[in-house]
Interface confidence: low
């Protein structure tokens, strides 16, 4: 191979000579020279660095402030940020999970078609024929309209997408 | 510190191979080219090519190819030079030297191994 | 290949004296970069070669200043301003511009 003009994976040039990046986990304290090897020292408590770098300072690990809602997910390491998610009833604002909001409830006439995460909302559906719902829910799907038939009764109020049918006795045939 | 740490002497008889293995230590290893330079007795020194552990690019000198494989294990930085159909005029010390980045020099030698071909 | 030519092929010396050692390459060793990649390098009796003068004048890591490197092109010196006893073994120039890499056959140094 002829002599190097530029540097390889996880190197950089420095003064025209390539140095070896700082793993993760750990930042620059010296550049390499033609007789030592680059100078890294590990990330403190609550910092971290994720790439092969050469960055003098560790980035700090991101704060779960509990007065937005957040709590940890996932402990930060020297390699790994913080990972937030919200506490139970809400969801993350953004894929950053820089703050929570309220899960959203389903009004009536419609029902949970899939429930909320940390990092996602409610997703309601409009409850079809058939099916209703009479509470405001971030949990409840909709339910079946009752089978009067079943129970040996009759339909005496037709159901909605927001209330169950009404059900009667059938009327006795007079002889 | 850095340091390159050979496997023992070996003993050959005309036609087997060899592998001589060469520790890695006190530096990033997936960073440095490793060479292999060998020194019959009582003679100078021939190159015989290197290799690039983070790709494994070899480059051989043209007098021993087909007869030599340069590998590396970058989980254990070991790199390891094996030589086949040997020759009574292989017997010579083997050395494996890293490759300065900036000096593109061998700065760093093993202790060399002994190897001996003979019937 | 290139050809390192080496002269003298032994040199004998005096403790406190200087000493010089010749290289010829049979091409140019210098690169577009501007670097010539002409290296020296010692092999005390019973020891694995070390680095001497990496690219025509850098001295290595702990390589005591009496040793110099100087030349251009196809001619180079290495100098020892004054010859200690330590500096008895056999001396390589080198070339790793061009494959196959290649050594010179060697200056062997001795104390008279």
């Known amino acids: 191979p002829e002599p190097p003009t530029a540097c390889r994976e996880k190197q950089y040039l420095i003064n025209s000579q390539c140095c070896s990046l700082c793993q993760p986990g750990q930042k620059l304290v010296s550049d390499c020279t033609e007789f030592t090897e680059t100078e890294c020292l590990p990330c403190g408590e609550s910092e971290f660095l994720d790439t092969w770098n050469r960055e003098t300072h560790c980035h700090q690990h991101k704060y779960c402030d509990p007065n937005l809602g957040l709590r940890v997910q996932q402990k930060g390491t020297s390699e790994t940020d913080t990972i937030c998610t919200c506490e139970e009833g809400w969801h993350c604002t953004s894929e950053a999970c820089e703050s929570c909001v309220l899960h959203r409830s389903c009004s009536p006439g419609f029902g949970v078609k899939q429930i909320a995460t940390g990092v996602s909302d409610t997703i309601c559906e409009p409850c079809p024929v058939g099916f209703f719902s009479n509470v405001s829910s971030a949990f409840e799907k909709c339910h079946p309209w009752t089978s009067c038939e079943t129970k040996d009764l009759v339909v005496q109020q037709a159901g909605t997408n927001k209330t169950d049918v009404v059900c009667g006795p059938q009327d006795r045939l007079r002889a | 510190q850095v340091q390159l740490v050979q496997s023992g002497a070996e003993v050959k008889k005309p036609g087997a191979s060899v592998k001589v293995s060469c520790k890695a230590s006190?530096?990033?290893?997936?960073?440095?080219?490793m060479n292999w330079v060998r020194q019959a007795p009582g003679q100078g020194l021939e190159w015989m090519g290197n290799?690039?552990?983070?790709?494994?690019?070899?480059n051989y000198n043209q007098k021993f190819k087909g007869r030599v494989t340069m590998t590396t294990d970058t989980s254990t930085s070991t790199a390891y030079m094996e030589l086949r159909s040997l020759r009574s005029d292989d017997t010579a010390v083997y050395y494996c030297?890293?490759?300065?980045?900036?000096?593109?020099?061998?700065?760093?030698w093993g202790q060399g191994t002994t190897v001996t071909v003979s019937s | 290949d290139i050809v390192m030519t080496q002269t003298p092929l032994s040199l004998p010396v005096t403790p406190g004296e200087p000493a010089s050692i010749s290289c010829r390459s049979s091409?140019?060793?210098?690169?577009?970069?501007?670097?010539?990649?002409l290296h020296w390098y010692l092999q005390k009796p019973g020891q694995s070669p070390q680095l001497l003068i990496y690219k025509l004048t850098n001295r290595f890591f702990g390589v005591p200043d009496r040793f110099s490197g100087s030349g251009s092109g196809t001619d180079f010196t290495l100098k020892i301003s004054r010859v200690e006893a330590e500096d008895v073994g056999v001396y390589y120039c080198s070339q790793s511009i061009h494959v196959p890499w290649t050594f010179g056959g060697g200056t062997k140094v001795e104390i008279k």
């Open positions: 290799i690039d552990p983070y790709y494994g690019n070899t």
């Open positions: 030297a890293r490759l300065g980045l900036q000096l593109y020099a061998l700065d760093y």
């Open positions: 091409q140019s060793l210098v690169h577009s970069n501007a670097n010539t990649y």
């Open positions: 006190g530096y990033t290893f997936t960073g440095y080219n």
